[in-house]
């Protein structure tokens, strides 16, 4: 039997990834820096499939259901060219209908649909955040 890798204390494991949900308020850049500070190649989380989105949403809903959460998706050139900060391919998308526009170039999991959909928001807003790494 293959031994499952372990995650850092307080992080949860699912399908070869470790996830850390932090209920502290950070702007997007500071949240990313804090994720990196935990080591192991951690970044703000990429969400690459409906399967992964559902697992994360279920986990977070066990803690709270009202606060949006930063993920690792951003639009660094401010041209609606979104990319994952960890370099993952931007294929799966889960934008809610009213996501884009304004000075909103960072993505959050929205509490409006149980964290299954994303909205863009101003990157300087201070919010909870989700980190991810491969152990």
């Amino acid at each position: 039997q293959i031994q499952r890798p372990s995650c850092a204390p307080g992080w949860f494991y699912h399908k070869s990834n470790c996830y850390g949900y932090f209920r502290k308020l950070r702007n997007w850049s500071d949240a990313e820096l804090e994720c990196q500070s935990y080591g192991n190649g951690a970044h703000l989380a990429s969400i690459l499939s409906l399967k992964e989105a559902s697992t994360i949403a279920e986990y977070i809903s066990g803690y709270q259901r009202s606060q949006p959460i930063w993920i690792g998706l951003h639009d660094p050139q401010k041209r609606q060219q979104w990319q994952w900060i960890d370099g993952a391919m931007y294929l799966y998308r889960s934008w809610s209908g009213k996501s884009m526009g304004g000075n909103k170039h960072c993505a959050e999991m929205s509490s409006n649909n149980n964290f299954l959909t994303w909205s863009s928001n101003e990157c300087n807003k201070r919010q909870h955040f989700l980190c991810k790494y491969r152990p």
């Epitope: 293959i2 399908k15 070869s16 690459l48 499939s49 409906l50 399967k51 992964e52 559902s54 993952a88 294929l91 799966y92 998308r93 889960s94 934008w95 209908g97 299954l116």
Partner: antibody
């Protein structure tokens, strides 16, 4: 090379049940979900549900709740679907399928299908 | 549940023709739409993922486009091996759903 090998055709009586198998080779069965898909004769595809062989967790389309039950045996890299209280509406080809890796949702790998015929 | 409506139900073409198959979703599914081809008595085969992403080993005559609710699969210069059923599938939300299919047949 990833392969999904399904069990052979079944002829079953109305009201009976049947268990179909899908044996996976070429990747670790615990790394992703295995899905089941139904195709009735000359018709489209219907998603039945998935199982996570690592945990045994399952999710089903509401239409198949109580009709289909997915299980797995990681030691033999095999997943099963149990179909109960069979009627003529359950006559179909059943496919197991999976994605290329956990971070994707499209069905890359398919079994060859198992034909289930429900007839008196 | 998200309903996928494919049109036309049947398309009669001659080899060498170009064709477009439509898949319309009952609500926005972003770009989370995949296309499959199924020959008679065979298993489905993935052609295009996430609306427009090509698949290794699939001929370049197959291409996809669209986002939101309207999607198109285009086949340039249809070959005889392309005849059969084409299905779209969404992975935007559970339950996963498929379209009823478009049958591509020889004129």
């Amino acid at each position: 090379e990833v392969q999904l090998q399904q069990s052979g055709a079944e002829l079953v009586r109305p009201g009976a049940s049947v268990r179909l198998s899908c044996t996976v080779s070429g990747f670790n069965i615990e790394d992703d979900y295995i899905h089941w898909v139904k195709q009735r004769p000359e018709q489209g595809l219907e998603w039945i549900g998935w199982i996570d062989p690592e945990t045994g967790n399952t999710q089903y389309a509401s239409k198949f709740q109580g009709k289909a039950t997915a299980t797995s045996d990681t030691s033999s890299s095999t997943v099963y679907v149990h179909l109960s209280s069979l009627t003529s509406e359950d006559t179909a080809v059943y496919y197991c399928t999976t994605t290329s890796y956990y971070g994707s949702d499209e069905f890359v790998y398919w079994g060859q299908g198992t034909l289930v015929t429900v007839s008196a | 549940d998200i309903v996928l409506t494919q049109s036309p139900a049947t398309l009669s073409v001659t080899p060498g023709d170009g064709v477009s198959l439509s898949c319309r979703a009952s609500q926005s599914i972003n770009n989370n739409l995949h296309w499959y081809h199924q020959k008679s008595h065979g298993s489905p085969r993935l052609l295009i993922k996430y609306s427009s992403q090509s698949i290794s080993g699939i001929p370049s005559r197959f291409s996809g486009s669209g986002s939101g609710t309207d999607f198109t699969l285009t086949i340039n210069n249809v070959e005889t091996e392309d005849f059969g059923l084409y299905f779209c599938q969404q992975s935007n939300s559970w339950p996963l759903t498929f379209g009823a299919g478009t049958k591509l047949e020889l004129k």
